[in-house]
């Protein structure tokens, strides 16, 4: 809105910081046993991998910036159930990447809900 | 604990995605206007800026990723206040930028609030 | 200052496409989305949908999925809306709006005035 | 979708006198991010449409501060304390919380 009173350099620096707030895949931490929803008498080690996760701002405030698209990476981490029985399993454990991402609006609720099976 | 099981190659794959993973400044996006506590008729744009903040996985589940160094990043945003009464104005906005991040016990919680001026 | 300026006036037969523009100016062209309302003559505003010009996606009210495009010439600053299958209840002034982030349609370009006859 | 009721449809109002448009949603308009999307634009005779107040209550630039929008969840106001000839026209209420956004149906606002 405002070219014709700012050098187009600043305007250029502004628009650069705006486009890398932007809505998209995102490297993230994200602790795998709560991921898995895994009961509490079973850890990981290392219990947090690094995946790709949607973030970012969106064009309208009342967007969300959600995934379109998913991966699932296969980490190999070691398994441990308490108390220790055996030695821990080192498994492949399969995580939500997001692949592609989209500013998405909120649909309206429905008065009943909807279960997924 | 597995060394005598495992090869030493997927060992250190394991090891590397948990130094990843480890509690850091990493580049975040965030709200310029809920970051600064505006009022609801001060305006940013672009609306988010992008600043290093604490997070990451910490060794123990009690333990929690804060920041324990901070510097205040100037970045060039203009600053639009509704209603319009004039050109939106170029201002250096300061935000935060985690410098440095350590997993920390979450403290007991105070009975009364403090409140910073 | 911010302006949206539109292309002209339309006439098209029943089962014509027709593909309206609407120039921008004044602001960064991808740092806001693009909204498109039609408004039948003597009726209200009826939303088509949406496109977000930084990279492309939309999203179209369902009632038009199907028949309605938006695309953007990003180094024109242009939005376009391709309307297919005209019918003679189409015939509308066709709006494009500028959507502000914190919400409401800011700006809007004057309307293009399409007529579906035979 | 969301359906935007206004009343009333017509408003024959004396110059100088208070104007109020009710907008009313079948569903609340309150956003998972705690914000409410409902707007108010004015459309001229001729006119493009032109928004007056954004999220519930906030005066668009250049919009006279005799107009001012209130309410919450589902019930909304646009109150004009004065009206003044240029503010004949008609009134929409619209919602951007959800898809597809929707408008009122129009207040046409007339002078006596």
């Known amino acids: 809105f405002a070219a014709t009173f700012y050098d187009i350099e600043t305007l250029k620096v502004i628009d650069e910081e705006w486009q890398r707030t932007q809505c998209s895949p995102r490297e993230t931490c994200v602790e795998v046993a709560s991921e898995l929803g895994k009961s509490t008498n079973t850890f990981f080690k290392p219990p947090c991998v690094n995946v790709f996760r949607c973030g970012g701002c969106c064009n309208e405030e009342s967007l969300i910036c959600m995934n379109t698209s998913t991966s699932y990476i296969s980490k190999q981490l070691f398994e441990i159930s308490v108390p220790l029985t055996s030695v821990p399993e080192l498994v492949p454990v399969k995580v939500a990447n997001h692949t592609g991402c989209k500013c998405l609006p909120t649909a309206p609720r429905h008065p009943y809900s909807i279960i997924r099976r | 604990f597995a060394a005598t099981f495992y090869d030493i190659e997927t060992l250190k794959v394991i090891d590397e995605e948990w130094q990843r993973t480890q509690c850091s400044p990493r580049e975040t996006c965030v709200e310029v206007a809920s970051e600064l506590g505006k009022s609801t008729n001060t305006f940013f744009k672009p609306p988010c800026v992008n600043v290093f903040r604490c997070g990451g996985c910490c060794n123990e589940e009690s333990l929690i990723c804060m920041n324990t160094s901070t510097s205040y990043i100037s970045k060039q945003l203009f600053e639009i206040s509704v209603p319009l009464t004039s050109v939106p104005e170029l201002v250096p906005v300061k935000v935060a930028n985690h410098t440095g991040c350590k997993c920390l016990p979450t403290a007991p919680r105070h009975p009364y609030s403090i409140i910073r001026r | 200052q911010v302006q949206l300026v539109q292309s002209g006036a339309e006439v098209k037969q029943p089962g014509a496409s027709v593909k309206v523009s609407c120039k921008a100016s004044?602001?960064?062209?991808?740092?806001?989305?693009m909204y498109w309302v039609r408004q039948a003559p003597g009726q209200g505003l009826e939303w088509m949908g949406y496109?977000?010009?930084?990279?492309?996606?939309?999203t179209y009210n369902q009632k038009f999925k199907g028949r309605v495009t938006m695309t953007t010439g990003t180094s024109t600053s242009t939005a376009y809306m391709k309307l297919r299958s005209l019918r003679s209840d189409d015939t509308a002034v066709y709006y494009c709006?500028?959507?502000?982030?914190?919400?409401?349609?800011?700006?809007w370009g004057r309307g293009t005035l399409v007529t579906v006859a035979s | 979708d969301i359906v935007m009721t206004q009343t009333p449809l017509s408003s024959p109002v004396t110059l100088g006198q208070p104007a109020s448009i009710s907008c009313r949603s079948s569903?609340?308009?309150?956003?998972?991010?705690?914000?409410?999307?409902l707007h108010w634009l004015q459309q001229r005779p001729g006119q493009p449409p032109r928004l007056l107040i954004y999220?519930?209550?906030n005066r668009f630039s250049g919009v006279p501060d005799r107009f001012s929008g209130s309410g919450a969840g589902t019930d909304f106001t646009l109150k004009i304390s004065r009206v003044e000839a240029e503010d004949v026209g008609v009134y929409y209420c619209?919602?951007?919380?959800?898809?597809?956004?929707?408008f009122g149906q129009g207040t046409k606002l007339e002078i006596k």
């Open positions: 709006a500028r959507a502000s982030y914190y919400g409401g349609m800011d700006y």
């Open positions: 004044g602001y960064t062209f991808t740092g806001y989305n």
């Open positions: 496109i977000d010009p930084y990279n492309g996606d939309t």
């Open positions: 569903q609340s308009l309150v956003h998972s991010n705690g914000n409410t999307y």
């Open positions: 999220k519930v209550s």
């Open positions: 619209s919602q951007s919380t959800h898809v597809p956004r929707t």
